[in-house]
Interface confidence: medium
């Protein structure tokens, strides 16, 4: 179920998978709700602790069996990822961290008038994932409305740092806010070139793509088809950046399926979830559980309903059946992604719908003349 | 869509162009895709063209002027008119098609979610209506997939400028008071949408207006929210079991 | 019916520049990768630049690279090509050609243009 | 690049004859191997795609064989109309035609 209440001075001991820097606890969370393992976060703001480097520390946590034992903490701000909780699901973060510094790369200065405006320029900027701005009374004059754009390699900053006249906070993109507009386009046989960020297995592009989407320093990918003559390389999908924001060179090349992050489409982003069900496939990777269940859409809502099911395969062969139910097979990996796909297989598989903003706990989303 | 612009692909993934073929093809009126096997669309779309078999429905088009005889679409297993509609009345502007076949969702081609039933406390202030229809009162039929983003109107405000017409609880309406933007013949039947709490629902269906854009009489569309009941009722008795986006 | 018609071609001096139309026809012009292929006289096939369907993508031979620039008019269903920098070695029938994509799997050049002749000569 | 090589360049013979061209890519190019038909002063007509497949309205005595980098053409029988100019052509990674073999009338 969807657990959103925050605890208060209390933080989660062990179960650590992942940490960093974050301005506040709803980002934090955030952060928490788009990884693939956080089940539980812990969150330490910069008045809660002395240590200068845990200062804004944000912790994402998982555990086999949901919870953590809580230890007070003077001021650390605990809580819940947001999987399983239909439309509170988003990666938008509109807050502007007002004495606030987030380092990061920075590769962009230029003045301007307000923090909105160094906002939209982040928004509006292919490579930004976070901003900090000097205002008009910063203590050094030669600084004073300065709009330093910033990245970093995980798109969280490298550090947080309690400076007075700066203000600070992320990109509007995940808000559908970027003036930049998205390719659509889906470009069959082309392979893109430039940096691998990280390759992942998915069964089709459109998966592939929406992983670009929503991976921090993604902002295009191509994918090697089932049929893709090494075998060793089928399906996956290898997410790409490059300086300029767009491949430097795309090669002709059969069996390949290229294609852009939609994180900069204006208005609409694509749900940061996956409901395709993929006939005569099998996800492999670590198992969670096994069940007896009728149907492959059951499997799939077995596998939404167990908040650390990532994927799922619903076997279909005589020796996993038992008259009507057949064996579900719920699975999960470090990434979230299946750690091999094979074809040919007795069954089907799919994603957990965890992250699907029209989930369980979402309402979804003449005469005088006729029309 | 009077005042609109273009669409691009994936905007709307709902919307659909239901066309009827009989000595040449022409689209009609919109829909909203809502299920693998389901659209909602308004009843007067049927008037005098009840015949399932004359109806071709295109999902995950932008640009009519690409539907070409090789175009997949969809026919009709089913078509459900609201059992209270009178061909006379504006009331009860609300039918569900049956399709032949379960479409498969693609990012171009996706069902919009159901509000709640009887929504009526949740406060909406961006509304879009989207459609292939004409661009003003004497216009034409358009190719590329309109949007305009319009806001509600109250029901109170909606009365005052319909004096001759009973705007029932069962109605929503959007315009401008200096009027400009509208839908327009060909639209109707297509979603009235508005984006709550970063989620996309089918506020209403397209379904009557005086002329289009007009100053100060806005456009009356089937309020969805109030006949969840019907399409709950009408999708599950259908096959068993509720193919569509439903609310919690 | 399905058509290609070419145009633009003719003689011009080495140095020189030429545009080459293509107007499509009988299909769905936007939804295919189109290509530009040359036969110089007496000799065979060679592909010269394909542009994607979008017109966001483009791809030439290393003969023609820096030199030629592929591009589309989705809303007039034509296809250019821009020749500069034109050689001797240019001359040729240029065709043009699309390359149908999807299930069942088509992705050779299937439908072909009658061809315009382009002189390059001095 | 990958490089297409025909063989034989040219060919003689008379109606009736069973007729095999083979071409050699310089690397796999899986079964991304398309034919032509080329008759002078005309555009080129595809036969056969996917290395086997024939294409709609080809004659059946047409077939493609072949995958990997060895690919033939074979003319079961040959007819008046078959006497033109053929070509294969890669669409692995970009695109490349072999040099094209001349079948002329013995």
């Known amino acids: 179920g969807c657990l959103t209440q925050l605890y208060e001075n209390a933080f989660f001991r062990g179960g650590d998978v992942a940490s960093m820097y974050t301005p506040n606890a709803q980002y934090c969370q955030m952060r928490c709700t788009f990884h693939p393992r956080c089940l539980l976060f812990s969150f330490l703001p910069a008045s809660s602790i002395n240590d200068m480097e845990k200062r804004f520390g944000c912790f994402l946590k998982d555990s086999v069996t949901g919870t953590l034992p809580k230890v007070h903490r003077t001021g650390a701000v605990s809580g819940h990822s947001l999987k399983q909780c239909g439309h509170q699901i988003s990666a938008c973060h509109r807050d502007i961290y007002k004495g606030v510094d987030m380092r990061g790369v920075n590769f962009n200065v230029s003045k301007v008038s307000s923090v909105e405006e160094c906002q939209k320029r982040c928004t509006s900027n292919i490579r930004c994932q976070f901003f900090s701005y000097a205002t008009q009374t910063f203590h050094k004059a030669e600084y004073r409305n300065n709009c330093l754009l910033k990245y970093s390699p995980g798109g969280t900053p490298t550090a947080i740092k309690v400076l007075s006249n700066v203000e600070s906070g992320f990109s509007l993109k995940p808000c559908a806010l970027s003036e930049i507009g998205c390719h659509m386009n889906i470009f069959q046989h082309l392979a893109f070139s430039d940096v691998d960020v990280a390759r992942v297995l998915t069964p089709d592009a459109f998966v592939c793509r929406t992983i670009c989407t929503y991976h921090p320093n993604c902002l295009f990918f191509t994918f090697y088809t089932n049929v893709w003559k090494i075998e060793s390389q089928r399906n996956v999908c290898l997410l790409k950046t490059s300086e300029s924001g767009t491949p430097s060179s795309s090669t002709p090349q059969e069996n390949t399926i290229s294609g852009y992050s939609l994180l900069t489409c204006k208005r609409t982003l694509p749900e940061p979830c996956h409901s395709k069900i993929y006939p005569g496939v099998d996800f492999g990777g670590e198992e969670l559980n096994v069940t007896f269940v009728k149907g492959v859409n059951v499997c799939q809502e077995t596998c939404t309903k167990m908040i650390r099911c990532q994927f799922f395969t619903y076997s279909l062969l005589p020796e996993d059946c038992k008259e009507e139910k057949c064996k579900c097979f719920l699975r999960l990996s470090m990434d979230g992604s299946p750690t091999r796909i094979a074809y040919g297989t007795q069954g089907s598989s799919g994603y957990s719908l965890r992250l699907c903003n029209t989930g369980d706990n979402s309402v979804c989303t003449t005469k005088t003349s006729t029309r | 869509i009077v005042g609109g612009t273009n669409s691009s692909w994936g905007e709307w993934p709902w919307q659909v162009s239901l066309q009827v073929k009989l000595t040449a093809q022409r689209h009609l009126c919109g829909g909203s895709l809502i299920g693998h096997q389901w659209v909602l669309t308004a009843a007067h779309c049927f008037d005098g063209l009840p015949l399932q078999d004359v109806w071709r429905i295109y999902s995950g088009i932008l640009n009519l002027s690409d539907i070409t005889k090789d175009t997949p679409f969809s026919q009709i297993k089913e078509i459900i008119i609201h059992q209270n509609y009178k061909v006379s009345e504006g009331n009860h502007d609300i039918a569900l098609i049956k399709l032949q076949a379960p479409l498969n969702y693609t990012e171009f081609q996706k069902p919009i979610c159901l509000p709640s039933k009887g929504d009526t406390s949740t406060i909406y202030t961006n509304c879009w209506v989207t459609g292939w229809g004409f661009s003003k009162e004497k216009g034409e039929i358009q190719n590329i997939l309109q949007k305009v983003n319009i806001p509600l109107v109250t029901n109170e405000e909606c009365q005052k400028r319909y004096q001759d017409y009973k705007i029932t609880q069962r109605m929503v309406c959007a315009g401008y008071k200096e009027g400009g933007k509208d839908a327009c013949k060909g639209d109707s039947g297509g979603p009235l949408v508005c984006k709550h709490n970063g989620m996309w629902r089918l506020v209403g269906i397209t379904s009557w207006g005086e002329g289009c854009a007009r100053r100060e009489q806005p456009g009356v569309y089937t309020k969805v929210a109030e006949y969840m009941d019907w399409i709950l009722e009408k999708t599950q008795s259908s096959d068993g079991k509720a193919q569509m986006q439903s609310p919690a | 019916e399905v058509q290609l018609l070419e145009s633009g071609g003719g003689l011009v001096q080495p140095g020189g520049s030429l545009r080459l139309s293509c107007a499509a026809s009988g299909f769905t012009f936007s939804h295919y990768i189109m290509m530009w292929v040359r036969q110089a006289p007496g000799k065979g096939l060679e592909w010269v630049s394909g542009?994607?369907?979008?017109?966001?993508?483009?791809v030439y031979a290393d003969s023609v690279k820096g030199r030629f620039t592929i591009s589309r008019d989705n809303s007039k269903n034509t296809l250019y090509l821009q020749m500069n920098s034109l050689r001797a070695e240019d001359t040729a029938v240029y065709y043009c050609?699309?390359?149908?994509?999807?299930?069942?799997?088509?992705?050779?050049?299937?439908?072909w243009g009658q061809g315009t002749m382009v002189t390059v000569s001095s | 690049d990958i490089q297409m090589t025909q063989s034989p360049s040219t060919l003689s013979a008379s109606v009736g004859d069973r007729v095999t061209i083979t071409c050699r890519a310089s690397q796999s190019i899986s079964s991304w191997l398309a034919w032509y038909q080329q008759k002078p002063g005309k555009a080129p007509n595809l036969l056969i795609y996917?290395?086997?497949t024939l294409e709609s309205g080809v004659p059946s005595r047409f077939s493609g064989s072949g995958s990997g980098t060895e690919f033939t053409l074979t003319i079961s029988s040959l007819q008046p109309d078959d006497f033109a100019t053929y070509y294969c052509q890669q669409y692995n990674t970009y695109w490349t035609f072999g040099q094209g073999t001349k079948v002329e009338i013995k």
């Open positions: 050609a699309y390359r149908r994509t999807g299930v069942p799997r088509r992705d050779s050049f299937d439908i």
């Open positions: 996917k290395a086997s």
């Open positions: 542009i994607y369907s979008s017109g966001g993508i483009t």
